[in-house]
């Protein structure tokens, strides 16, 4: 007998190669300079295959002695850039991603760009910048968001199963109506889980479910009409 | 693209019966509910039942019970809608849907006149 | 069963307005439903499946959200071809019940 189990819906989002920045213009910079020294670590999602674009303190450059940008990644030697006004050279110790690079060249502009973010680059970014004036810093917790694959299917008589799968972080299911429902996760070695949620439906005049996932790349739902029961031919509804 | 074709109109008698067909393609006949629904002139749609043609498995709205008999035939991947006991009240646009209510029919006028 | 209200029941438009209607579940209940325009003689065509999701070659100035267990559809700036009646399908629960429409008519 044929199974909606092979009905499978699949969802994956696609997203055109965008940029994030936390980056101010110089009319933000003059307004807000005392607010942001102040706040010298950001937590900030990125969606991974994004691009990514990472901001000293608004500091003018005239006023520079040393910038040095530190790169703290999982499971990786700190690396540092830096960049020597009074010399103009730039120096780097143990880097090794070719997609961190300066936006531009330092002397001109000391932000620090991430061409199309990968789970690896999931780390902390601190800018340090020297002056006469002392030291400013201001430090990026970057956390990668990696958008769910959803799928969702028919295993057995009035049971569902809706999973996403390697999101990051780990996505959140409910279901319309609610059923009988068991939720496991699976963490995987890059960071991402998946999330698996089996329920079960006894009512009878429930037609159609919808699994609905929430995260923080964005929601989707799908839905799926539930088999009949074998052996049921005929009932009034 | 899954493509409903149904019968043509028809017009009843009182008392009389009316067997409207459905035929499906596109899709995995066996493995979608089919559902019917009618509209009565310049009123709203009501459901009257659904069959799942993989089984056999068949719920009929209470209002039509005892008055309503849905079939398919997997062979053409043809669903049939019979509905018996006519009267005028019946007159509506029947429709079949599947796909979860997204693929229609173009509908078939039904005229339950004497 | 549940009960499909739908509002408003009529609606006199502009071209160019931003039209909403909304279907709500008797009691609240949480479903899922789909949105569908239907012009005189002819079957309903589907704009939204799913609440939320438009459908292949419907214009983008058609959308629909949820909000709680209130179902709206919004026509960003009307056009004279979209004079019709829209309504609502749920289809959550047997028996599948419609909202009774939403008739768009020229001022």
């Known amino acids: 007998q044929p199974n909606n189990s092979l009905m499978l819906q699949t969802s994956k989002e696609n997203h055109a190669l965008a940029s994030s920045s936390l980056c101010m213009d110089e009319k933000q910079i003059t307004q807000n300079y005392s607010k942001v020294l102040a706040e010298v670590n950001t937590s900030w999602p990125v969606k991974m295959a994004t691009n990514a674009v990472l901001c000293c303190p608004p500091i003018a450059l005239r006023n520079l002695i040393i910038i040095t940008w530190e790169i703290i990644l999982r499971g990786q030697p700190s690396c540092t850039k830096a960049y020597k006004k009074e010399t103009n050279e730039t120096k780097e110790t143990n880097c090794t991603d070719e997609r961190i690079t300066w936006v531009s060249r330092p002397d001109q502009n000391s932000d620090l760009q991430i061409r199309t973010v990968a789970i690896t680059h999931d780390g902390y970014y601190r800018c340090i910048m020297v002056t006469p004036d002392g030291n400013f810093h201001r430090g990026y917790h970057l956390q990668v968001l990696v958008t769910p694959e959803v799928t969702l299917f028919q295993n057995r008589n009035r049971t569902a199963v809706c999973k996403a799968v390697a999101g990051k972080p780990a996505a959140h299911i409910s279901w319309i109506p609610e059923g009988d429902c068991a939720t496991k996760q699976e963490y995987w070695s890059n960071g991402t889980v998946t999330v698996k949620s089996t329920c079960h439906w006894e009512v009878h005049n429930v037609s159609t479910v919808t699994c609905h996932v929430s995260h923080l790349t964005g929601n989707k739902s799908l839905y799926i009409e539930l088999l009949p029961v074998p052996g049921a031919k005929k009932s009034a509804k | 693209q899954v493509q409903l074709v149904q019968s043509g109109a028809e017009v009843k008698k009182p008392g009389a019966s009316v067997k409207v067909s459905c035929k499906a393609s596109?899709?995995?006949?066996?493995?979608?509910?089919m559902h019917w629904v009618r509209q009565a002139p310049g009123q709203g749609l009501e459901w009257i039942g659904n069959?799942?043609?993989?089984?056999?498995?068949?719920n009929y709205d209470e209002k039509f019970q005892g008055r309503v008999t849905m079939t398919v035939d997997t062979s053409t991947s043809t669903a049939y809608m019979e509905l018996s006991s006519l009267r005028s009240e019946d007159t509506a646009v029947y429709y079949c849907?599947?796909?979860?209510?997204?693929?229609w029919g173009r509908g078939t006028l039904v005229t339950v006149s004497s | 069963d549940v009960q499909m209200t739908q509002s408003p029941s009529s609606l006199s438009v502009s071209v160019g307005d931003r039209v909403t209607m909304t279907c709500q579940a008797s009691?609240?209940?949480?479903?899922?439903l789909h949105w569908f325009q239907q012009k005189p003689g002819k079957a309903p065509k589907l704009l939204i499946s799913?609440?939320?999701n438009l459908e292949d070659g419907v214009p983008s100035r058609f959308s629909g959200s949820r909000y709680g267990t209130a179902f709206t559809l919004t026509i960003s700036s009307l056009q004279p071809e979209d004079i019709a009646t829209y309504f609502c399908?749920?289809?959550?629960?047997?028996?599948?019940?419609f909202g009774q429409g939403t008739k768009l008519e020229i001022k």
């Open positions: 069959i799942y043609p993989g089984s056999g498995s068949i």
């Open positions: 596109g899709h995995t006949f066996t493995s979608y509910w």
């Open positions: 399908l749920q289809f959550t629960y047997i028996p599948w019940t």
């Open positions: 849907l599947t796909m979860t209510g997204t693929s």
């Open positions: 009691q609240g209940t949480p479903i899922n």
């Open positions: 799913g609440a939320s």
